[in-house]
């Protein structure tokens, strides 16, 4: 195989692979016909000038996960055929200015996970064919203006996880073919207007995990081809009107973990491909009418972990395909009876961990397909008659941790819960909070002894004896015409109380998604 070094393996397809900690210097002699050379997981610390002189046919050189800290200026001389070069996962702190001057046909250059502190303005000046440049995970404090000016063919650029705090507005001005730009995990606090204006072909822009506080109104207006925009975990407090109006192809947008206080009507411009919108972990206090009205294909809207105290009746207008609405862990005290009116396809709604004192009887009136409703940990004392009458698909209803007032007005709910016990799940059941004589007793199984027809709970109920939700028949309604003839507050007999099982599987986004 034309003199394969003893510490390497060589194939007749001119593939040379040298791996292992026992290798401390560049192996030689390398076979003259080598087309692919991989040097991986060695203890090589430096790359001298003369090691590649005889392998001019080399197309791919991968020197990854070594101890490489020093590269001589002429190390890559004579590698004019080289297309792919990876020096990732080494210990490089700086690169000689003219290191790459002889490899001007390079298509991919991977320099990720080194310790680079600076890039010289002329470092990449000859790379007109370069398509991919990876600089992720270095210590670059700033990007010099002009450093990318000659990379006219570049389609993918990763500058994530460096330390830079600002960008020059002209740094990307010649990258008209760029499709992927990753700037995540830096310390950017603001992005100058015009920074992305030249990037008409950009499809992915990753800005998550920076310190961005404000977005210029027209920041993305020239990026009509954007498909993925990641803005999560920044300090964004305000979305300027129209900020997203020119992004019709967007199919992934993350805004969770910011400081958003409000959303202006229609801020989310037409985005027919957007399926999910995650706005959890912000500081949103209210939702105006038509906040999401252009998102007619949206299926999941996550607004949990905000500070919502008011939702306008028309806030969810236009969300005709919404299937999942997460409003848990907010400060809601009241909801308008029409707030869900336009959500004809809603399947799951989570309202737990709020301060809801009551619900309008019509709140679920037009949401006939609801399957899960989470109402635990609110301030509910009762529910209106007939509130669940029409919800034939309801299979999961969580009502525990509310201060249920078990007087005669609770009877219709009590009766319905007995008949629909399986829908409450097997974790924690709703418990009476008042009057004092029944505090702590299960609302579901308490035996109510009033004059007139008695409603008996199961005699010795076992949680496991009830069928699971998925096999339970359609729900029996609380009749909105039930005449309550029973009276008195305190005539209850405690038949049995089930100890609550503290296994509360809060429906909604996963921990990873909803914080």
């Amino acid at each position: 195989y034309y003199g394969c070094p003893s510490e390497c393996t060589c194939s007749r397809a001119s593939q040379v692979e040298c791996t292992g900690a026992q290798i401390v210097a560049m192996p030689s002699p390398l076979p003259w016909n080598a087309m692919s050379l991989q040097i991986l997981n060695t203890h090589i610390t430096e790359l001298p000038e003369d090691k590649f002189l005889n392998i001019s046919a080399l197309i791919a050189l991968k020197m990854e996960k070594n101890e490489l800290a020093n590269i001589m200026p002429g190390a890559f001389r004579n590698l004019g055929s080289l297309r792919h070069l990876s020096l990732a996962n080494n210990k490089l702190k700086n690169l000689p200015v003219r290191l790459f001057q002889d490899v001007n046909n390079l298509e991919t250059l991977l320099l990720s996970n080194n310790q680079l502190v600076q890039i010289q303005p002329a470092q990449f000046s000859q790379f007109s064919n370069l398509k991919e440049l990876q600089l992720y995970g270095n210590n670059l404090e700033y990007i010099p203006e002009g450093v990318f000016d000659h990379l006219v063919g570049l389609t993918k650029l990763n500058l994530g996880n460096n330390g830079f705090t600002h960008l020059s507005p002209r740094v990307f001005q010649h990258l008209g073919n760029l499709q992927v730009l990753r700037l995540y995990e830096n310390r950017l606090s603001d992005i100058p207007m015009g920074t992305f204006d030249a990037l008409g072909n950009l499809q992915e822009l990753a800005l998550q995990e920076n310190q961005i506080g404000t977005l210029s109104p027209g920041l993305f207006h020239n990026n009509r081809n954007l498909q993925r925009l990641y803005l999560s975990n920044n300090h964004i407090s305000h979305l300027p009107p129209g900020i997203f109006m020119q992004l019709p192809h967007l199919n992934k947008l993350t805004l969770f973990g910011n400081s958003l206080k409000e959303l202006s009507p229609g801020v989310f411009g037409p985005m027919p491909n957007l399926r999910e919108l995650w706005l959890y972990n912000n500081h949103i206090t209210s939702l105006p009418d038509n906040a999401f009205s252009h998102l007619n294909q949206l299926q999941v809207l996550i607004l949990s972990h905000n500070q919502l105290s008011y939702i306008s009746p028309g806030a969810f207008n236009g969300l005709t395909n919404l299937r999942e609405l997460s409003l848990h862990t907010n400060a809601l005290q009241d909801l308008d009876g029409n707030v869900f009116r336009s959500l004809a396809n809603l399947r799951n709604v989570s309202l737990q961990n709020n301060r809801l004192r009551q619900l309008p009887g019509s709140i679920f009136a037009n949401v006939n397909g609801l399957m899960t409703i989470q109402l635990q940990n609110n301030n509910l004392e009762n529910l209106p008659l007939g509130i669940f009458d029409h919800l034939g698909n309801l299979c999961e209803l969580r009502l525990y941790d509310n201060p249920w007032r078990c007087d005669s007005n609770i009877l219709p709910l009590h009766d319905w819960l007995i008949l629909n016990r399986a829908r409450l799940g097997t974790d924690t059941l709703p418990v009476c909070s008042s009057p004092a004589s029944v505090r702590g007793q299960s609302l579901v199984i308490i035996n109510v002894n009033f004059p007139g027809p008695s409603v008996q709970g199961p005699e010795t109920p076992e949680v496991s004896s009830y069928p699971d939700t998925s096999s339970y028949p359609d729900s029996t309604s609380i009749s909105s015409t039930t005449e309550i003839t029973r009276s008195t507050d305190d005539d209850y007999t405690d038949l049995n109380t089930i100890e609550p099982i503290d296994d509360r599987n809060t429906w909604g986004m996963t921990d990873a998604q909803s914080g």
Epitope: K156, R182, Q203, A206, V300, T510
Partner: antibody, heavy 122, light 107 residues
Framework: QVQLVESGGDLVTPGGSLRLSCAAS????????MTWIRQAPGKGLEWISD????????DYADSVKGRFTISRDNAKNSLYLQMSSLRAEDTAVYYC???????????????WGQGTMVTVSS | EIVLTQSPSSLSASVGDRVTIKCRAS??????LAWYQQKPGKAPKLLIY???SLESGVPSGFSGSGSGTDFTLTISSLQPEDFATYYC?????????FGPGTKVDIK
């Protein structure tokens, strides 16, 4: 270990219905999108549907839209595909797969089941 | 719908050969492309994601490159266990279409 196991494949007549199941183990099922892919005998792979991590968002290939329904039960670590109005061209091995994606550029079906055969024939 | 075409549809090669498979998208898909390997009677296995990133546990002899519309999977030195069918797949937009496959068999 991380695995997916499909079941429910059978021989069914045209116009009939079938429900496929996929049992997941070895990972936090509720953290991941899930997907169904099929492969007709001697043919290539066809993506047919996927579902978001909490079950809220779904999408379908045009070839099955209106006939197939994807669903999941995170409490049971299970994924389902309800198939109705079955046609001869639905004959295939059906795979469930974990759709792993993140905002760092990762996109891929990284865990696959072994597949279950569905035959639609009179 | 984005259409992916692969070339060649099949190829014959020997152990030790360098193999290149191309995948072309009908429109730009940035780098949202994956490559899979499938052996007869088995489920596919993810090799490459994000067009060029090697999935954990996959031998370093596999590499991917490209972005936009033209992508390449390279096997630098074909091993006996690499004889299989290879598929590309795009994640840029729904539906998540696959290429028709390239079968690599023994010469």
């Amino acid at each position: 270990q991380v695995q997916l196991v499909e079941s429910g494949g059978d021989l069914v007549t045209p116009g009939g219905s079938l429900r496929l199941s996929c049992a997941a183990s070895g990972f936090t099922f509720s953290d991941y999108y899930m997907t169904w892919i099929r492969q007709a005998p001697g043919k290539g792979l066809e993506w047919i549907s996927d579902i978001g991590s909490s079950g809220g968002s779904v999408d379908y290939a045009d070839s099955v839209k209106g006939r197939f329904t994807i669903s999941r039960d995170n409490a049971k670590n299970s994924l389902y595909l309800q198939m109705s109005s079955l046609r001869a061209e639905d004959t295939a091995v059906y795979y469930c797969a974990r759709y792993n994606w993140n905002d760092r550029g990762y996109d891929g079906f990284d865990i696959w089941g072994q597949g279950t055969m569905v035959t639609v024939s009179s | 719908e984005i259409v992916l075409t692969q070339s060649p549809s099949s190829l014959s090669a020997s152990v030790g050969d360098r193999v290149t498979i191309k995948c072309r998208a009908s429109q730009g898909i940035s780098s949202a492309l994956a490559w899979y390997q499938q052996k007869p009677g088995k489920a596919p296995k993810l090799l490459i994601y994000d067009a060029s990133s090697l999935e954990s546990g996959v031998p370093s002899g596999f590499s991917g490159s490209g972005s936009g519309t033209d992508f390449t999977l390279t096997i630098s030195s074909l091993q006996p266990e690499d004889f299989a069918t290879y598929y590309c797949q795009q994640f840029n937009s729904y539906p998540h279409t696959f290429g028709p496959g390239t079968k690599v068999d023994i010469k």
